[in-house]
Interface confidence: low
């Protein structure tokens, strides 16, 4: 069944956690719908971002941190392994130096740690899509 | 009660025809919602658009049309009279030679046509807001 | 439109527990995620717990571990489970529904009028 959307839960992050969601775009990539992840450092929707990653489907990514309120280097990558009007899984896993982000089973994206992923209190997902999977998994110590 | 979003209705517009909507933004202005209203000229979300209109909540407002596929010259505004977690109610009013924008009663915006509305046949509301009223009403003869 | 009223706040001793009980109107309450935020006299509205359309939840920091949160969509209830109450408890508890899940009192767009908690040492 679908989630809600925005769709926010309380999450710990570290080392070998997998963040997984599946979803699929509201409108066709003609129309630039967006898919906006967004870790956040507290359970409130203003607190800073440890990692912004935001699609505009069919036209681009863009990855970026907010610290003390104010964003900071954008970093942007053409890559679209997105299908107009088909599901996607998306895979976000904290690696020790980066985030490793998979899409459909293929590694796409990188972003390297600017903030410890500790720090991370609170994932949400929104913007243009539909959701039908949320899941945080923790590397078995 | 609440309209899903995407919402889309079909709709003939003319000199005299009101659109109307209510909603609210689903996120705080700092992190930039976005409410999107296109007058579409087929019940096809590819069509071409009479009048794209797309706030950026607390940041800029684009207009737009699209026409063969592609879109045309973009006009912007810095004006924003919507309120960060308020409820707005805007209105696009079909005037002989332009849509008229209210925002909470307040002309915010216009638009010269460069399709005639009679070519519009669907309005979709979509983006970063929760509906609460969608309503077209047509000038009396 | 969905109409919420909220039951079940009272007095009690510091320790003790309550039950509290939203009952919702409306053919749709099983398609809105629910909410429970308390606000205290003076102080900003706070967010206590949600549980999602499928009965996923989540809880603020401060009540982890003390509070349950559930739903009943036969019923068209949410109750909120109180235990081991503490006097920073007491305050106005209010049910909100919405068609996001979320922390944010914005994100919910039907409110009851709350009910009183009050905890004392």
């Known amino acids: 069944s679908l989630l809600p959307v925005p769709y926010t839960e309380a999450a710990s992050l570290s080392t070998g956690s997998t963040v997984t969601i599946k979803g699929r775009p509201l409108a066709c990539f003609l129309n630039e719908p967006y898919l906006q992840v967004d870790f956040h450092t507290e359970m409130k929707e203003e607190s800073d971002i440890v990692f912004h990653f935001q699609v505009c489907f069919g036209r681009r990514v863009v990855m970026n941190s907010r610290e003390y309120g104010a964003w900071k280097q954008q970093v942007e990558s053409k890559n679209m392994p997105f299908q107009d009007g088909q599901e996607f899984e998306l895979s976000i896993s904290v690696l020790p130096d980066k985030y490793q982000v998979m899409v459909n089973g293929q590694s796409s994206y990188t972003f390297d740690h600017r903030i410890k992923p500790e720090a991370v209190k609170m994932v949400q997902v929104w913007r243009d899509i539909s959701l039908t999977k949320f899941n945080v998994s923790y590397l078995k110590r | 009660s609440l309209l899903p979003v995407p919402y889309t209705e079909a709709a003939s517009l003319s000199t005299g025809s009101t659109v109307t909507i209510k909603g609210r933004p689903l996120a705080c202005f700092l992190n930039e919602p976005y409410l999107q209203v296109d007058f579409h000229t087929e019940m096809k979300e590819e069509s071409d658009i009479v009048f794209h209109f797309q706030v950026c909540f607390g940041r800029r407002v684009v207009m737009n049309s699209r026409e063969y596929g592609a879109w045309k010259q973009q006009v912007e505004s810095k004006n924003m009279p919507f309120q960060d977690g308020q409820e707005f109610e805007l209105s696009i009013s079909v005037l002989p030679d332009k849509y008229q924008v209210m925002v909470n009663g307040q002309s915010s915006y216009t638009f010269d046509h460069r399709i005639k509305p009679e070519a519009v046949k669907m309005v979709q509301v979509w983006r970063d807001i929760s509906l609460t009223k969608f309503n077209v009403s047509y000038l009396k003869r | 439109e969905l109409q919420v009223v909220e039951s079940g706040g009272g007095l009690v001793q510091a320790g003790g527990s309550l039950r509290l009980s939203c009952a919702a109107s409306?053919?749709?309450?099983?398609?809105?995620?629910m909410a429970w935020f308390r606000q205290a006299p003076g102080k900003e509205r706070e967010f206590v717990a949600a549980i999602t359309r499928s009965g996923g939840n989540t809880y603020a920091d401060s009540v982890k571990g003390r509070f349950t949160i559930s739903r009943d969509n036969a019923k068209n209830t949410v109750t909120l489970q109180m235990n081991s109450l503490k006097p920073e408890d007491t305050a106005a508890y209010h049910c909100?529904?919405?068609?996001?899940?979320?922390?944010?009192?914005?994100?919910?767009?039907?409110w009851g009028q709350g009910t009183q908690v009050t905890v004392s040492s």
């Open positions: 409306g053919r749709t309450f099983s398609t809105y995620s």
């Open positions: 909100a529904a919405g068609g996001t899940y979320s922390f944010v009192p914005r994100s919910y767009n039907y």
